[in-house]
């Protein structure tokens, strides 16, 4: 978790002098509770936006937006703590809006936004906005949270972001798999424009079951430049096992930008349809 281009983080707006600060996610008001605390944020919204860095890279960011409730507690609002927790790693990053002037009611509802948390493809986050100071123990909570899932690199708009492109999202191998006679599979796919090796991972399953009955790995050496964007054809020999008929073919590239952590593509061959064999009709009728 990180912030995008830490340079120009702004939270000031007409009628409010405000600064954005790094936060330890443990505000002082936890340790030294105050008697009077503000109410919780209203209408917390999370959106996925895309932002360019100064270097021109494109990253997905969480756009966080919320409004204030129109009650008197606005007079005791000293700022807000924004927290983003990545659920699969428990990594948390916080920033603090510090209000340098008192808030006053005005003709429009106060609205705040922040769009600098960089998020990763296919990751889920818990986004929380805490008004400060935080409530006294047993006080009414003054935060709002939402769980936010970022689309993976298969998504059309995500595909062109820097983290997705780094993991090989622009490569479309267009895999085709056909079953040949004599227990063989022919796998065909389009090579990318990089001189790097590939691996084909074959996993076979019985019909309607999910434990594998055969596994095989096939190494494909790095193509020469004249072979870039050409089709590569590989014939794999299957184990002669009755019923081991559903095959998943996965192609793992080893691009320089992602090494052994590149996006994999797969294709599946289903078991052949079993024709319903009707009961044979006898060509004579027994008398008894």
């Amino acid at each position: 978790l990180r912030l995008l281009d830490h340079r120009a983080l702004v939270c000031s707006q007409p009628g409010l002098n405000c600064t954005v600060k790094n936060s330890t996610c443990l505000d002082d008001s936890w340790i030294h509770p105050r008697n009077l605390t503000p109410s919780s944020p209203k209408d917390l919204q999370i959106q996925l936006h895309f932002a360019h860095t100064q270097q021109g890279d494109l990253f997905p960011v969480a756009h966080i937006e919320w409004t204030l409730q129109t009650d008197a507690s606005i007079l005791y609002l000293e700022g807000a703590e924004l927290s983003v927790l990545q659920l699969n790693t428990n990594e948390r990053l916080c920033v603090r809006f510090e209000f340098l002037s008192k808030l006053r009611h005005h003709h429009r509802r106060w609205r705040f936004t922040f769009s600098h948390f960089v998020v990763d493809p296919d990751q889920e986050y818990e986004v929380t906005v805490h008004h400060l100071p935080k409530p006294i123990p047993d006080g009414d909570p003054n935060h709002q949270s939402k769980n936010f899932l970022v689309p993976d690199c298969e998504h059309a708009r995500m595909k062109v972001t820097t983290p997705c492109m780094s993991s090989g999202s622009l490569w479309d191998p267009n895999i085709t798999v056909e079953t040949l006679e004599a227990h063989q599979l022919r796998v065909s796919f389009t090579l990318w424009n990089e001189s790097t090796h590939y691996q084909i991972l074959l996993t076979s399953f019985p019909h309607m079951e999910n434990h594998s009955c055969f596994e095989h790995m096939h190494h494909i050496p790095a193509p020469r430049p004249e072979e870039f964007h050409q089709r590569s054809n590989v014939t794999l020999t299957l184990r002669n096992l009755k019923g081991c008929c559903r095959h998943q073919v996965q192609i793992q590239p080893f691009f320089s930008s992602c090494l052994n952590d590149c996006l994999r593509h797969s294709a599946t061959v289903s078991c052949p349809e079993m024709p319903d064999t009707p009961e044979p009709i006898p060509d004579y009728m027994p008398l008894w």
Epitope: D43, I46, Q47, L48, K146, F148, L149, P151, H155
Partner: nanobody, 127 residues
């Protein structure tokens, strides 16, 4: 323009099934997560179920888990809600809702100001 049109509602007896459909137009349907939200007579809005752009993640409210199934067909720009074992408390106006942005939120749309609503389809469960 952007439009969501729900259909499939009606009067049904407890224990029976209904399938709601939502036809989307005017936006790139397979870019966005979608939700079903309902409003019982005289009550507030209740989130029912949500599905990501590629059906990779699906969530349900506890009140409908195990009975309702959300699905989508991106080729047909359509969202569905299969409702089985219906109860009287499922009586409500059912809305199809589009996320405002490309992300997905568990437990309801990422924005309380839902971007796009349909006109709703009424489901009445009564004996």
């Amino acid at each position: 323009q952007v439009q969501l049109v729900e259909s499939g509602g009606g009067l049904v007896q407890p224990g029976r099934s209904l399938r709601l459909s939502c036809a989307a137009s005017g936006f790139t349907f397979d870019d966005y997560a979608m939700h079903w939200v309902r409003q019982a007579p005289g009550k507030g809005l209740e989130w029912v179920s949500g599905i990501t752009w590629n059906s990779g993640r699906i969530d349900y409210a506890d009140s409908v888990k195990g009975r309702f199934t959300i699905s989508r067909d991106n080729a047909k720009n359509s969202l569905y809600l299969q409702m089985n074992s219906l109860r009287t408390e499922d009586t409500a106006l059912y809305y199809c809702v589009k996320e405002r942005s490309l992300g997905y939120c568990r437990g309801g749309p990422c924005s309380d100001a839902f971007d796009i609503w349909g006109q709703g389809t009424m489901v009445t469960v009564s004996s």
